[in-house]
């Protein structure tokens, strides 16, 4: 492993780390946000940052309800400097191989370089190639959406089925759900799970004459995806007179394996590729986003890219003190490593964003769920928060109880768009939603003490049950509206938050060796399920489970 990007092995070696430990002991753990607001009339002014998108729309990030003061922020910024976060950031944006364990560039940022500035990997300016893929996506999506592209019987396409898993599924699923308001021409379906139910239920609701299948697998060898793709192909052929020539009008590939794509029967003109410097969980910006372009239209897809590009520009050009993703990442480190917080809640107060926490879960946990640093040593500190979330207000009626009164500190991000796409009942729904967005953050901060509880009439043993400790940190993210540009910006914000965390922890946020072992063992066990013999090659538990399964199957 190449550790040429950082000159420290462990974050705990950095002077600012020790300084933060002292600050935590002397003031951090007793800091009262409520009192900080009383002490500093300019606190909100100082600790909220407004991001202006390329189209002039704005997103406000309010960090003022976090467990910080000027001294803590200054020490966190010092930590970022000592960890050389900006150096690693600049190396990433220069196309250097910062994914050291796989010796690859990490260049998803090049996919949204709509300014078309030269961006180099290994001496090659990839901007023209990125632009070319987008032109291909634009031409293809416009043909399909307009009805110019026709199925084998001459009917226009009405449904798109994206078959992929992990990064080839989560991103498009989340984005198409989030931007449903911008759709209308086509219906889109996603099949990811190897569980036959997923593909079977999808095939029940589509018509082979009017369905386009997108097979999303970079290598075209991902077991789940290729199994599902073959099932889809067999279904399609069985419904269309077993004529393989029809496949060309109904299947496209999001892949780079031209040989396997051709073998499958897909016309390689309908192959949309992306390079090895695009990680799966960062691939929604690439050809993997074709289902998004088909669903919301290419112009909206480009606005989505431009929103992310605007955050990239902010991240690379803004001084640390005002750098929004950097501050978000530093706060995460502060809670994780000094307060011992193990989780991070993201609650979108927006039904369209209902898959956003699931998407961020992969982004954050697959990136930073590591325990070995770039210096090839095990960390002696916590990394990778457990990220979870659900849309509010639903979440208020499930796990918010634990956030308010549980024994764990759960730093939370609340997200709201001021303007609803559906301002029904004279904005009544939107006002109720917004009032909860503001109230929850306020309640978590101010809490409710014994005196207030008693004043409200509670007595005896009931009093402690109604007390809220408060001082529970939230970041409020208030957008004007969830547009393609806003969504692109929000995703890029969290990407760079994740990057900042990983840079400080000195881990490689861009590999995922943790997914390999299970895959290998599943292949071995797969063969054992093909015969009727009793299995005894594993531990007693695994043997017992396999044998019982075989008996019941």
């Amino acid at each position: 492993s190449n550790n040429s990007f950082t000159n420290f092995k462990l974050a705990t070696e950095l002077p600012a780390w020790s300084k933060l430990q002292k600050i935590y002991e002397s003031q951090g753990k007793t800091l009262s946000v409520k009192q900080e607001f009383q002490k500093d009339a300019k606190r909100f002014e100082k600790l909220n940052k407004t991001f202006t998108n390329y189209d002039g729309s704005k997103i406000l990030f309010d960090y003022s309800k976090n467990l910080v003061n000027d001294e803590i922020i200054a020490a966190l910024i010092e930590l970022a400097k000592e960890a050389n976060v900006t150096g690693l950031r600049d190396a990433m944006f220069k196309g250097e191989h910062i994914n050291s364990t796989e010796d690859r560039a990490v260049y998803h940022v090049a996919l949204r370089n709509r300014a078309n500035k030269p961006m180099y990997v290994d001496g090659v300016n990839v901007a023209p190639e990125v632009d070319s893929v987008l032109k291909h996506m634009k031409e293809f999506s416009e043909q399909v959406r307009s009805g110019e592209w026709k199925g084998y019987t001459g009917k226009k396409i009405t449904d798109v089925v994206n078959i992929g898993i992990g990064g080839s599924d989560l991103g498009p699923v989340m984005v198409t759900e989030a931007l449903k308001h911008y759709a209308g021409v086509l219906d889109v379906h996603f099949v990811s799970n190897i569980d036959g139910t997923h593909i079977a239920e999808t095939l029940k609701v589509v018509d082979p004459e009017t369905t386009l299948f997108l097979i999303a697998s970079k290598t075209f060898t991902t077991a789940e995806t290729i199994t599902n793709a073959n099932t889809a192909k067999n279904w399609f052929l069985s419904k269309t007179g077993n004529d393989p020539s029809h496949i060309a009008k109904h299947f496209a590939a999001l892949s780079t394996n031209e040989t396997e794509v051709a073998k499958f029967g897909i016309d390689t003109k309908n192959m949309f590729g992306f390079e090895s410097w695009v990680g799966g969980r960062y691939s929604v910006w690439s050809a993997i986003g074709l289902s998004v372009a088909l669903y919301i239209g290419y112009d909206n897809f480009e606005a989505f890219l431009k929103g992310a590009e605007a955050v990239d520009n902010h991240f690379t050009q803004t001084p640390l003190e005002d750098n929004i993703p950097l501050l978000g990442g530093l706060l995460s480190v502060w809670y994780n490593n000094f307060f011992g917080a193990q989780t991070h809640l993201v609650a979108p107060f927006d039904q369209y964003l209902h898959r956003f926490p699931a998407y961020l879960q992969q982004l954050s946990m697959e990136s930073n769920g590591k325990s070995v640093t770039r210096g090839n040593v095990f960390t002696d500190y916590s990394t990778g928060s457990i990220l979870f979330g659900e849309p509010a207000t639903n979440a208020q009626h499930s796990f918010f109880q634990l956030v308010h009164q549980g024994t764990k500190l759960i730093p939370s991000d609340f997200i709201l768009a001021a303007q609803s796409h559906n301002p029904i009942e004279n904005k009544l729904h939107q006002k109720m939603l917004a009032s909860n967005f503001f109230a929850q953050a306020e309640a978590l901060m101010v809490g409710k003490d014994e005196e207030q509880v008693k004043a409200e009439g509670a007595t005896g043993g009931l009093v402690p049950h109604k007390v809220f400790s408060g001082n529970r940190p939230t970041t409020s993210i208030l957008a004007q509206k969830i547009t393609p540009a806003t969504l692109g910006a929000l995703i890029a914000y969290y990407e760079h938050v994740t990057f900042t965390e990983g840079a400080i922890w000195n881990i490689n946020s861009f590999d995922q060796w943790g997914v390999e072992l299970g895959k290998v063992l599943a292949k071995v066990i797969g063969k054992e399920l093909d015969n009727s013999s009793t299995i005894s090659t594993h531990d007693a538990s695994t043997n017992g489970l396999i044998n019982q399964f075989k008996e019941w199957m």
């Epitope: 990997v121 190639e129 070319s132 893929v133 032109k135 291909h136 396997e260 992306f274 390079e275």
Partner: nanobody, 117 residues
């Protein structure tokens, strides 16, 4: 800056062999279908052979059995081995790269092949 630089052309007797080579720079070579085209004086440019990103080859009828195209992704190079040359193979030979995933292509400057006794 993208460059496709051909080499290996020259004068050869009928029945002889030549090996044309094209060195590419400034492109993600492994993502391009590479090809050789030729243009004889007063004629249209025509396909000789192509090789896809996956290594599948395609030859013009006149080249089949005599010419072999190959690629070396590690060194960003494509070669055309030409055997049993005859006077009809006399032409300027051009290296061509076509991006596999979108409308993007580049041409070399060409190298002259003359088959004459």
């Amino acid at each position: 800056q993208v460059q496709l630089v051909e080499s290996g052309g020259g004068l050869v007797r009928p029945g002889g062999s030549l090996r044309l080579s094209c060195a590419a720079s400034g492109i993600t070579f492994s993502s391009y279908t590479m090809g050789w085209y030729r243009q004889a004086p007063g004629k249209q440019r025509e396909l000789v052979a192509t090789i896809t990103t996956g290594g599948s080859t395609n030859y013009a009828v006149s080249a089949k059995g005599r010419f072999t195209i190959s690629r070396d992704n590690a060194n960003n190079r494509v070669t055309l081995q030409m055997n049993s040359l005859n006077s009809e193979d006399t032409a300027a030979y051009y290296c061509h790269s076509r991006f596999a995933y979108g409308p993007l292509e580049y041409w070399g400057q060409g190298t002259q092949v003359t088959v004459s006794s």
